[in-house]
């Protein structure tokens, strides 16, 4: 089993504040009560859970930092999605901060890739076509457009 098999739902179906756990687990958008008898809804915009769980608390929503824009808000089943502002990118080696993209390529190099929220501009040597050694490779986008539906605890 991998987490890949256990995708969160895009939008929670309307549910009551409390419901019963299934095999000791609560669905996305909920956490389990301390006595283990109830599933309690997360608070919209405050906390969330993306998977079936037995958490005693939902997870706190991320707040986008200055220098980031909010792509999608926190729901009860999905954390906030933040993205670096235009002209900046998040480096894989230091994902906590957005860094300014370079404005141009060094002499003798030509730009072959634009600044994106996930990568700096990409420069290659004019003759050889090899990447500049200081180049940060593009990071695969982790935001997914169609996450599918959650696995039930007995799947």
């Amino acid at each position: 089993i991998t987490q890949q098999d256990l995708a969160p739902q895009q939008r929670a179906a309307p549910q009551q504040k409390r419901s019963s756990p299934s095999e000791g687990l609560c669905p996305p958008g909920h956490h389990i009560s301390e006595d283990g008898r109830d599933c309690i809804s997360c608070k919209y915009g405050q906390d969330y859970s993306t998977h079936w769980n037995d958490l005693l608390f939902c997870l706190r929503c991320t707040r986008c930092d200055s220098g980031e824009v909010e792509l999608s808000p926190c729901t009860t089943t999905r954390n906030t999605v933040c993205q670096c502002e235009e002209g900046t990118f998040r480096e894989e080696d230091s994902p906590e901060m957005c860094r300014k993209c370079r404005t141009g390529c060094p002499r003798g190099m030509v730009k072959v890739g634009d600044c994106t929220p996930w990568s700096d501009i990409e420069c290659v040597h004019k003759e050889s076509g090899t990447k500049h050694s200081g180049e940060v490779p593009a990071v695969e986008e982790t935001v997914t457009s169609s996450p599918g539906t959650p696995a039930s605890p007995c799947s």
Partner: antibody, heavy 121, light 111 residues
Framework: EVQLVESGGGLVQPGGSLRLSCAAS????????MSWVRQAPGKGLEWVAA????????HYPDTVKGRFTISRDNAKNSLYLQMNSLRAEDTAVYYC??????????????WGQGTLVTVSS | NIVLTQSPDSLAVSLGERATINCRAS??????????MHWYQQKPGQPPKLLIY???NLESGVPDRFSGSGSRTDFTLTISSLQAEDVAVYYC?????????FGGGTKVEIK
């Protein structure tokens, strides 16, 4: 306060068997995943087995699959690990843990003090 | 199996100074905005204790000088101001897939 107390460890010969027990208190035992984690002397941690709240879903790593059996008795708030065909490399402190579930068995929220199993002739 | 490699193996830091421990996974442990990486502290003669779950969530009762960060394959546990009681071995653990695996541990000592 959550308390997990292991028992049943001891010295056993290679090829032998041993049954470990864990008595749980301070938590609704029948609501939670439980697990065993071991630590060989002076070494790191290794997950050994996990079981869901009603015993219907069980997980093992390949290193112990077919030799170890995890089980639980919710009426007694107890977790068990039956270990057969023991080898020298199974020598370790065995910890009973409350395993948080988040999409998968996830992180070990509470730990017992451990019980030492020594496999030697 | 996902292999977790911790660095350094041991670390000596002065009291009040920052300690940084790294954990690298052999493949990404991220999905849907969650990083399935967790951190534990084990003091001599004691069982491990959960510090951080899902990369950056501080377990209840853990001092806020401990923090976790990182995503995909690279994760960091930081002790912002080392205290004498922080002398221990620290382990990372992933739950992206079965089997659950731990890093080899990093021993933190006082310089």
């Amino acid at each position: 306060e959550v308390q997990l107390v292991e028992s049943g460890g001891g010295l056993v010969q290679p090829g032998g068997s041993l049954r470990l027990s864990c008595a749980a208190s301070g938590l609704p035992f029948n609501s939670y995943y439980m697990s065993w984690v071991r630590q060989a002397p002076g070494k790191g941690l290794e997950w050994v087995a996990a079981i869901n709240s009603n015993g219907g879903r069980i997980h093992y790593p390949d290193t112990v699959k077919g030799r170890f059996t995890i089980s639980r008795d919710n009426a007694k708030n107890s977790l068990y690990l039956q270990m057969n065909s023991l080898r020298a490399e199974d020598t370790a402190v065995y910890y009973c843990t409350r395993l948080t579930y988040y999409g998968n068995p996830a992180w070990f929220a509470y730990w017992g003090q451990g019980t030492l199993v020594t496999v030697s002739s | 199996n996902i292999v977790l490699t911790q660095s350094p193996d041991s670390l000596a830091v002065s009291l009040g100074e920052r300690a940084t421990i790294n954990c690298r996974a052999s493949e990404s442990v991220d999905i849907y905005g969650n990083s399935f990486m967790h951190w534990y502290q084990q003091k001599p003669g004691q069982p491990p204790k959960l510090l951080i779950y899902l990369s950056s969530n501080l377990e209840s009762g853990v001092p806020d000088r401990f923090s976790g960060s990182g995503s995909r394959t690279d994760f960091t546990l930081t002790i912002s101001s080392l205290q004498a009681e922080d002398v221990a071995v620290y382990y990372c653990q992933q739950s992206y897939e079965d089997p659950l695996t731990f890093g080899g541990g990093t021993k933190v000592e006082i310089k």
